[in-house]
């Protein structure tokens, strides 16, 4: 009855502060409307990073000011988080909700630990 959500355990952000990972869910039914939310868990506090609702077969659209972008293919969502800095290192949880048609299902991933290393400043050249 529970919906399983899979995501990688660890991802290393690029030097430009970009991290990408796949969030895959095992849909118990034929959902047409899906909500995907990325949550950040730090010190047992959970906050929303970004969220998008999409119709199956359509593109995933985050708000214009969102730090996330993504694409969907079947029961798989490819998520990209941008603008990350070392202080953003933490556990990023993929949450999937099958909003329509009934019944509603909730799926929570185990989280992806994203490591962000701020790039060293370039040394001054003579």
């Amino acid at each position: 009855k529970a919906m399983h959500v899979a995501q990688p355990a660890v991802v290393l952000a690029s030097s430009r502060g970009i991290a990408s990972f796949v969030c895959e869910y095992a849909s118990p039914g034929k959902a047409t409307e899906v909500r995907v939310t990325v949550l950040r868990q730090a010190d047992s506090q959970v906050t929303e990073v970004c969220a998008a609702t999409y119709m199956m077969g359509n593109e995933l659209t985050f708000l214009d000011d969102s730090i996330c972008t993504g694409t969907s293919s079947g029961n798989q969502v490819n998520l990209t988080i941008q603008g990350l800095r070392a202080m953003d290192t933490g556990l990023y949880i993929c949450k999937v909700e099958l909003m329509y048609p009934p019944p509603y299902y909730l799926g929570i991933g185990n989280g992806t630990q994203i490591y962000v290393i701020d790039p060293e400043p370039c040394p001054d050249s003579d």
């Epitope: 529970a2 949550l39 609702t53 909003m99 009934p102 509603y104 299902y105 909730l106 929570i108």
Partner: antibody, heavy 118, light 108 residues
Framework: QVQLVESGGGVVQPGRSLRLSCAAS????????MHWVRQAPGKGLEWVTF????????YYADSVKGRFTISRDNSKNTLTLEMNSLTPEDTAIYYC???????????WGQGTLVTVSS | EIVLTQSPGTLSLSPGERATLSCRAS???????LAWYQQKPGQAPRLLIY???SRATGIPDRFSGSGSGTDFTLTISRLEPEDFAVYYC?????????FGQGTKVEIK
């Protein structure tokens, strides 16, 4: 701090209607799904209805389907429950509750009592 | 619909004793989707445990949750006077959202 305050309860005759409201404050209302849960006197908790972030998706318990309507106004941070064709079995304290990020009902209002009696 | 059955209906214990409350589901519930609530007379329910074993903010560590599949447990290691109340389990993984019928923990 997060606050949910219900209002609109009272005594109503069987077959009549009542409208409950829940005023939300202290959080970004549109970012959370919401529920109504009720509790008959001396009884346990019964989930009544759910509404999605934008109000487009609604779910109801079989016991209220076709009689109750949930809605929300994200611009006013308000959740509403329209109750029609009330019966004595609908007598209960009605709570609005917020869905936490990970799914449980993390904040509840203080409840409003609805009594259906002739 | 997932039916949750709690046992016992009433638990009579003294302060300082250990309380063990059970919640059994009619079908498998992912451990991420099981919560426990506490309710005192005249008050709204309060979230204690979510995800079967994670304590909600501000909940003392004498409360702990465990279990998976269809069998879940709430344990209060040492009962304090303020812990005497009714406890409900809930599944929130799929609609309809359902609650157990409650276990009353009363003073012996």
């Amino acid at each position: 701090q997060v606050q949910l305050v219900e209002s609109g309860g009272g005594v109503v005759q069987p077959g009549r209607s009542l409208r409950l409201s829940c005023a939300a404050s202290g959080f970004t209302f549109s970012s959370y799904t919401m529920h109504w849960v009720r509790q008959a006197p001396g009884k346990g908790l019964e989930w009544v209805t759910f509404i999605s972030y934008d109000g487009n998706n609604k779910y109801y318990a079989d016991s209220v389907k076709g009689r109750f309507t949930i809605s929300r106004d994200n611009s006013k941070n308000t959740l509403t429950l329209e109750m029609n064709s009330l019966t004595p079995e609908d007598t209960a304290i009605y709570y609005c509750a917020r869905t936490g990020w990970l799914g449980p009902f993390d904040y509840w209002g203080q409840g409003t009592l609805v009594t259906v009696s002739s | 619909e997932i039916v949750l059955t709690q046992s016992p209906g009433t638990l009579s214990l003294s302060p300082g004793e250990r309380a063990t409350l059970s919640c059994r589901a009619s079908q498998s519930v992912g451990s991420s989707y099981l919560a426990w609530y506490q309710q005192k007379p005249g008050q709204a329910p309060r979230l204690l445990i979510y995800g079967a074993f994670s304590r909600a903010t501000g909940i003392p560590d004498r409360f702990s949750g465990s279990g998976s599949g269809t069998d879940f447990t709430l344990t209060i290691s040492r009962l304090e006077p303020e812990d005497f109340a009714v406890y409900y389990c809930q599944q929130y993984g799929s609609s309809p959202w359902t609650f157990g019928q409650g276990t009353k923990v009363e003073i012996k």
